[in-house]
């Protein structure tokens, strides 16, 4: 049950590994989520080394999996949101060929 | 098949400490982020601590920051918890998990999805 | 530090019988749509095994009977029909990125 797409592992940094993560970053929606909430202050790699990495999307670090992923924007796909979807027309297809 | 053996787990007096071991086999062990969970006789589950698949980040509840130290040598395939300053309410099982997970579209989906046996600590004068 | 409050606390039910188990949480579990909750089975001398992830999604291996629903601070487990089998007691699980990863504080089922 475990499938992974999109995923780049980050060099790994040495003087990382004493850090501990006891703030919380996900961002969240409504009500009270993500309020009152301090940043952690570790660097985050899609601030630094993959900033540009994902070119239509939004980069994504996972620290649970040491990883940088992108969250691609409508109709981009791919390991860095780089390739589009050539959307068929299915519909408008299937009439032309009644 | 996924195994998770822990081990290390007896009797200590208030105060002292203790070192949980898990052996992990049957995956990619450095591929997964993992954690121990405990359970205290008769009561409900705990998470007690994560660390990220390198080792980079740690995660722990208030209950235990400071006294409990999460580790992994993924050359060895193993997962440990070093715990100082014991009281006697951490007098449980041990559990080692796997982060069983999903990635899509930039999102992050985990969930244990695999358990050790456990190991009993109790801490007693 | 989100909150998950399950209930009943327990529960006894025949089997053939429909079990429902909710779980409350403190605050939103959602994140554009996903909701980061799990379902856990204990039966006694065990440890825990998954049954559901982010709410529905049923493990490998977990019989028909076993559902998941629900999505923001709402989420419950069903099973239906009740086997004799099911005994045991069930926890809900957030798994957000924000520690701490709280359970619920556990259901008790019964059979008849």
């Known amino acids: 049950s475990v499938r992974v797409e999109q995923v780049v592992k980050p060099p790994q940094n040495k003087t990382e590994s004493e850090n501990t993560s006891d703030k919380p970053k996900r961002k969240k929606k409504g009500g009270k989520n993500g309020k009152n909430r301090r940043n952690r202050k570790k660097k985050n790699p899609c601030n630094a080394e993959f900033q540009n990495f994902c070119i239509h999307g939004e980069c994504k670090y996972i620290e649970h999996l040491e990883a940088v992923t992108c969250k691609c924007q409508q109709e981009y796909f791919g390991e860095r949101c780089g390739e589009k979807s050539m959307k068929t027309h299915s519909m408008i297809d299937s009439s032309l060929s009644k | 098949e996924v195994q998770l053996v822990e081990s290390g787990g007896g009797l200590v007096k208030p105060g002292g400490s203790l070192r949980l071991s898990c052996a992990a086999s049957?995956?990619?062990?450095?591929?997964?982020?993992m954690s121990w969970v405990r359970q205290a006789p008769g009561k409900g589950l705990e998470w007690v601590s994560t660390i990220s698949t390198g080792g980079s980040h740690t995660y722990y509840p208030d209950s235990v920051k400071g006294r409990f130290t999460i580790s992994r040598d993924n050359a060895k395939n193993s997962l440990y918890l070093q715990m100082n300053s014991l009281r006697a309410e951490d007098t449980a099982v041990y559990y080692c998990?796997?982060?069983?997970?999903?990635?899509?579209?930039?999102?992050?989906?985990?969930?244990?999805?695999?358990w050790g046996q456990g190991t009993l600590v109790t801490v007693s004068s | 530090d989100i909150v998950l409050t399950q209930s009943p606390a327990s529960l006894a039910v025949s089997p053939g019988q429909r079990a429902t188990i909710t779980c409350r949480a403190s605050?939103?579990?959602?994140?554009?749509?996903?909701?980061?909750i799990n379902w856990y089975q204990q039966k006694p001398g065990q440890p825990p095994k998954l049954l559901i992830y982010a709410a529905s999604n049923k493990d490998t291996g977990v019989p028909a009977r076993f559902s998941g629903s629900g999505s923001g601070t709402d989420f419950t487990l069903t099973i239906n029909p009740v086997e004799a089998e099911d005994t045991a007691n069930y926890y809900c699980?957030?798994?957000?990125?924000?520690?701490?990863?709280?359970f619920g504080q556990g259901t008790k089922l019964e059979i008849k």
């Open positions: 605050e939103s579990v959602d994140y554009d749509g996903h909701s980061f």
């Open positions: 998990a796997r982060h069983g997970y999903l990635l899509y579209d930039g999102y992050y989906e985990w969930y244990f999805d695999y």
């Open positions: 699980q957030q798994s957000t990125e924000d520690p701490p990863y709280t």
């Open positions: 049957g995956f990619t062990f450095n591929s997964y982020a």
